[in-house]
């Protein structure tokens, strides 16, 4: 009786099972009753990634350097090319197939995380006590300038954009 | 019936042209490659191409045969072709086409070409 | 390309015979890639052995093949009349030139 159902990594064609081809390689001719399933590597710029019976192996991923792009790791036969993106570039999706700046965080705000390759500059805002008055894609927010361990006092408030201003203490008393 | 027929052969003049077919039955060009192989009289085979599976395939040829000979197929009739243009006696053969490219899997009977004035 | 070279080109056996036949490549090969095949007069080819030493459902096991590197064998361990035909390598150069190559044949008889 002919199988309705193949086990794992087989396929069904013809009223028979035929092992599917191993990852790296692709699919030449299906089993017959005297052969096992006919299956080549893929190229060296080609890859699949599963077992699988397809006639056609898949085209490594090129990181473009003109899109800012860049090999991270090689492909194999198995597995695709990953990119990433040169320095002071992140990706503009999980895919990565185009880069754009890292954000600066404007005054105010300071970076939370430095960008990577593959995400971008997280910024928070600077909290009281704190501040930041560049735009940076690399500084943090700053602690106020403390007055007092200068023996000084404030003479101007701080903000989340400017240190605070220190100055002698009034002697008149 | 798994099985391959080829057909077109026959009496050719030097310098003419000829089409060979392969109809299969029992089994798909789409996943299968699928070659041609020739036998001279009395000698021995002769690798002509091979195409592989897929809806197009790619095509390979013995460097002799690069430029005269053009394997194709029709996924859709399940048939194979072999275009042969400026034959010469030398190519005078009884050209079979098999299942496969690696191992062959499956032959036609084969069908008899001869290239003569 | 590559060149299969098959030896002996012919041979006389008696039934029961152990047959050897070899074939030898110009360069180093891929046993992957490495056939054997008997015909018979006025019949198409039939494949015994792929893979080097892959032997064909329904081919019997007298038959056997083995080798590496340039060097191929196909034994036919204990030969039957049936037997008595044309044996050929194939190669195919796959993933540099793609050309398949057989090799000359060897023809084995009775003595």
């Known amino acids: 009786e002919p199988p309705t159902a193949c086990r794992e990594k087989q396929y069904l064609i013809n009223s028979q099972c035929c092992s599917l081809c191993q990852p790296g390689q692709k699919l030449v001719s299906d089993c017959t009753e005297f052969t096992e399933t006919e299956c080549l590597p893929c190229s060296e710029s080609e890859f699949l990634d599963t077992w699988n019976r397809e006639t056609r192996c898949h085209q490594h991923k090129y990181c473009d350097p003109n899109l800012g792009l860049q090999v991270q790791q090689k492909g194999t036969s198995e597995t695709d090319t990953i990119c990433t993106c040169e320095e002071g570039l992140h990706c503009t999706s999980e895919s990565c197939e185009s880069c754009v700046p890292h954000r600066s965080c404007l005054p105010g705000f300071g970076v939370k995380q430095i960008a990577t390759g593959v995400s971008d500059t997280i910024c928070e805002p600077c909290p009281v006590g704190f501040f930041s008055n560049v735009s940076s894609a690399f500084e943090k927010c700053r602690p106020w300038t403390s007055c007092e361990t200068k023996d000084l006092v404030v003479q101007q408030a701080g903000t989340n954009k400017t240190d605070v201003v220190c100055g002698p203490q009034d002697r008149q008393r | 019936e798994v099985q391959l027929e080829e057909s077109g052969g026959g009496l050719v003049q030097p310098g003419g042209s000829l089409r060979l077919s392969c109809a299969a039955s029992?089994?798909?060009?789409?996943?299968?490659?699928v070659s041609w192989v020739r036998q001279a009289p009395g000698k021995g085979l002769e690798w002509v191409g091979s195409i592989s599976a897929g809806s197009s395939g790619s095509t390979y040829y013995a460097s002799w045969a690069k430029g005269r000979f053009t394997i194709s197929k029709d996924t859709s009739k399940t048939t194979l072709y072999l275009q042969m243009n400026s034959l010469r006696a030398e190519d005078t053969a009884t050209y079979f086409c098999?299942?496969?490219?690696?191992?062959?899997?499956?032959w036609g009977q084969g069908t008899l070409v001869t290239v003569s004035s | 390309d590559i060149v299969m070279t098959q030896s002996p080109s012919s041979l006389s056996a008696s039934v029961g015979d152990r047959v050897t036949i070899t074939c030898q490549a110009s360069h180093s090969i891929s046993s992957t890639y490495l056939s054997w095949y008997q015909q018979k007069p006025g019949q198409a080819p039939k494949l015994l052995i792929y893979?080097?030493?892959t032997l064909a459902s329904g081919v019997p096991s007298r038959f056997s093949g083995s080798g590496s590197g340039t060097d191929f064998t196909l034994t036919i361990s204990s030969l039957q009349p049936e037997d008595f035909a044309t044996y050929y390598c194939?190669?195919?150069?796959?993933?540099?030139?793609?050309?398949?190559?057989f090799g000359q044949g060897t023809k084995v008889v009775i003595k």
């Open positions: 098999a299942r496969g490219y690696t191992y062959l899997t499956l």
């Open positions: 893979r080097a030493s």
């Open positions: 029992g089994f798909d060009f789409s996943t299968n490659a």
């Open positions: 194939q190669y195919t150069d796959y993933g540099s030139s793609y050309v398949s190559t």
